[in-house]
């Protein structure tokens, strides 16, 4: 049955017959109302106040009508749709393409995809009529997305008489002479010839190589980027690109330093359903960087739970330095990672020994001054972790990074619900906690306990009558991460270290200050 | 290959003060260290800089006078020594560091003079 | 500040010969994270010193097999087996275990 639409020719976005919706007007603060009749949009001026409550992503402003409940967002440069969720500027997707919200609309047959709004796909599956439609990048665009985790984006296109999916053509990151790798490299074409011991790797057309499997006379030789040239590669599906050396006159194969593109403090973030003491029960895939962290007691048999852990590279964990007092050997540690349910395995988690850890050598066991500590994963090669949706790091911040006060932040933890009680969280849970300004984070605010220059303090600054739930970490939580959004990217601030009670209204939480120790860090985890 | 490119001799006045730049190419995450030799002398550590983070570690004797800074989107790192005196006329090398100090730059002459 | 002690200053050798660079540290240069950064590097006349041995023991690439290291704790060695006329130079150790990290004073090996 045909239908007669509205396209709006400033934002590309369709309507139906007697649909109206609202639009900012460029480079002015004014809003038009616009309805859809007989095709044509007609528009006016319409009065407008500020949102009652956030709505627009990346910075935008939201204004809702004044008279009735639509609301519009005025995107900042290189943001576009409704709640200002369209990246205009990304021009590749990273990884299987889920956090992808670029603005390709081409499938591989060249066909144009489909606005998610069509009526025409109201049955499919995915369509941007979900009530998660913002949350899985659809809406009133007809850009390729990946809302099912399928292996790249996609989008329906209307062939053979029907709307089927198909995928796109949208440029993956990792093509092209990237000097950089995602996931194992397999997709890497970049020009690094250096292994990790500093070795030359030699030509894929050596004659050396004569035998071996993959060399520029593979059949599929170009197809895996090899040829004559002596660039690292991965043409086996190994856990990162390599090439072909002689040592000490011997034929063999080394891991490459290639780098591998930074996809730190990217996440599947979805909104947490359930309320608990203290915060909001959350899945792991929203905090992909927590590490549960169990160690074998000399007392006890099997292993208890000891502390939160953050995953800041492939092979290196942060934690407190107050969770190794025990001074447990390594090999009594255990850290997973891609857990949802403390003690209940992950379909997807990642299960390491521990090969060594480092205590700051000045920790303070009184004042929890300099409370950090790095442990290295064991592995047999120089990965450990494999990034997923569940297993990713966090970014590091930047030596600078100097955030406004009362920024929003976010920590995670298996923690107790609160201070008295037994028992630690069976789940993982978040807490929203703001960052109190240095005037604010001083001895006399904490009952005198020293507070030190290496610390930061968060809280939940809601008004708490008797019964509000505030927001906080609590026993159990120590080691893991505070993390706030910096540039588009969850970025580590703080550790979660100590404080007095939990989610008591005014008592700030206390963390490690992560920026006084980004060179101590990086000096530790050289090779 | 990772190849740093430096910056040109200077000659400067004591009081004064100097910027050296090393221009790195290859796989840059690695941290830049700055190493100086007066002449006929040996070589003298004077800090580090990550390039990813911008974290910095300084030899005493340089903190307060030295400061090294990163620009990553032209893969260049820059060490300015301020306050200049005779004794700072030396060649100023960056070195890059992943498993040891690898990568040399050419070295750039500083010369204090009145 | 770890002190690093080279012996001798200055060492002439004939060609084909053996020749050993001793390096003294002021105290144990093992790093917090069980490595030991101790590192040989050459400086040719007129050129920027390069890389030949790091962690101890580990040849840089391309440097021949003719150069080792050994040592632990306070006191390591490199060893030429046997030098050649192009090995002519100063021989720094250095360490980078403990801020600030440090150069030996240099030993110049000159051919006899």
């Known amino acids: 049955s045909y239908q007669v639409i509205c396209r709006d020719e400033k934002t590309q976005m369709i309507y139906q017959q007697h649909q109206s919706w609202l639009r900012p007007v460029l480079r002015s603060n004014r809003v038009e109302y616009c309805w859809c009749n007989s095709g044509r949009a007609q528009c006016h001026s319409v009065p407008v106040k500020s949102c009652s409550e956030p709505r627009c992503f990346n910075g935008g402003t939201c204004q809702q009508a004044l008279y009735f409940s639509d609301f519009v967002c005025q995107c900042p440069e290189g943001f576009a749709g409704k709640c200002c969720e369209i990246d205009t500027r990304a021009t590749c997707y990273e990884d299987q393409g889920i956090s992808y919200r670029g603005t390709w609309s081409t499938a591989e047959s060249g066909a144009e995809c489909t606005n998610w709004n069509s009526s025409a796909l109201a049955q499919k599956p995915y369509s941007g009529r979900r009530p998660d439609a913002i949350r899985l990048g659809l809406g009133n665009h007809n850009y390729c997305r990946n809302p099912d985790r399928d292996s790249k984006p996609w989008c329906y296109v209307f062939k053979a008489g029907k709307y089927s999916s198909e995928f796109c053509s949208t440029p993956a990151c990792s093509e092209g002479n990237s000097d950089c790798y995602f996931g194992n490299g397999s997709a890497y074409r970049g020009t690094h010839s250096l292994t990790e011991s500093g070795a030359s790797c030699l030509p894929w057309n050596s004659m050396i190589l004569i035998g071996k499997v993959y060399t520029a006379q593979n059949p599929s030789a170009q197809a895996l980027g090899l040829g004559k040239h002596n660039y690292c590669r991965n043409p086996d599906g190994d856990a990162k690109p390599w090439c072909h050396v002689l040592k000490n006159r011997r034929l063999t194969w080394e891991y490459c330093d290639v780098p591998s593109c930074s996809t730190c403090g990217l996440r599947q973030y979805s909104q947490p359903q359930f309320r608990i003491k203290g915060g909001l029960f959350a899945d792991i895939a929203s905090h992909p960087w927590q590490a549960a962290i169990f160690a074998k007691h000399r007392r006890s048999p099997g292993e208890r739970f000891l502390c939160g852990g953050i995953l800041i590279s492939s092979c290196w964990i942060l934690s407190a330095a107050h969770c190794f007092q025990e001074r447990f050997p390594p090999h009594h540690l255990t850290v997973i990672l891609g857990r949802t349910y403390r003690v209940v395995p992950g379909e997807e988690e990642q299960k390491f020994e521990v090969e060594k850890y480092i205590v700051h050598k000045e920790f303070d066991d009184d004042t929890y001054d300099n409370d950090i500590a790095l442990l290295q994963l064991k592995s047999d090669s120089s990965r450990c972790a494999q990034e997923s949706s569940v297993v990713r790091t966090v970014c590091l911040p930047p030596a600078d990074l100097q955030l406004p006060d009362w920024t929003e932040c976010e920590l995670s933890g298996y923690g107790k619900h609160e201070a008295l009680s037994p028992f630690y969280s069976e789940r993982l849970k978040e807490a929203h906690v703001r960052l109190y300004p240095s005037s604010r984070c001083t001895s006399q605010h904490l009952l005198n306990r020293t507070v030190t220059d290496n610390m930061l303090c968060a809280g939940d600054t809601r008004s708490g009558g008797p019964q509000a739930n505030l927001h906080d970490a609590c026993q159990g939580d120590s080691g893991g991460p505070l993390v706030c959004l910096n540039d588009g990217r969850m970025t580590l601030v703080g550790i979660i270290s100590w404080g007095l009670g939990c989610g008591q209204k005014d008592v700030p939480g206390v963390y490690t200050k992560v920026t006084n120790y980004l060179d101590w860090i990086r000096d530790n985890m050289r090779p | 290959q990772v190849q740093l490119v430096q910056s040109g001799a200077e000659v400067k006045k004591p009081g004064a003060s100097v910027k050296v730049s090393c221009k790195a190419s290859?796989?840059?995450?690695?941290?830049i260290n700055w190493v100086r030799q007066a002449t006929g002398q040996g070589l003298e550590w004077m800090g580090r800089?990550?390039?990813?983070?911008?974290?910095?570690g300084y030899a005493q004797k340089f903190q307060g006078r030295v400061t090294m800074t990163v620009n990553t989107s032209i893969s260049t790192a820059y060490m300015e020594l301020s306050s200049l005196r005779s004794e700072d006329t030396a060649v100023y090398y960056c070195?890059?560091?992943?498993?040891?100090?690898?990568?040399w730059g050419q070295g750039t002459l500083v010369t204090v003079s009145s | 500040d770890v002190v690093m002690t080279q012996s001798p200053l200055s060492l002439p050798v004939t060609p084909g010969e053996p020749a050993s660079i001793s390096c003294r540290s002021s105290?144990?240069?093992?790093?917090?994270?069980?490595?030991?950064?101790l590192d040989w590097y050459l400086q040719k006349p007129g050129q920027s010193p390069q890389l030949l041995i790091y962690?101890?023991?580990n040849r840089a690439s391309g440097v021949p097999d003719r150069f080792s290291g050994s040592g632990s704790g306070t006191d390591f060695t490199l060893k030429i087996s046997r030098v050649e006329a192009e090995d002519v130079g100063v021989y720094y150790c250095?360490?980078?275990?403990?801020?600030?990290?440090?150069f030996g004073g240099g030993t110049k090996v000159e051919i006899k």
């Open positions: 105290q144990s240069i093992v790093h917090s994270n069980g490595n030991t950064y």
């Open positions: 962690k101890v023991s």
């Open positions: 800089i990550d390039p990813g983070g911008g974290s910095t």
């Open positions: 290859g796989n840059t995450s690695y941290w």
């Open positions: 250095f360490q980078g275990s403990h801020v600030p990290w440090t």
């Open positions: 070195a890059s560091y992943y498993y040891a100090m690898a990568y």
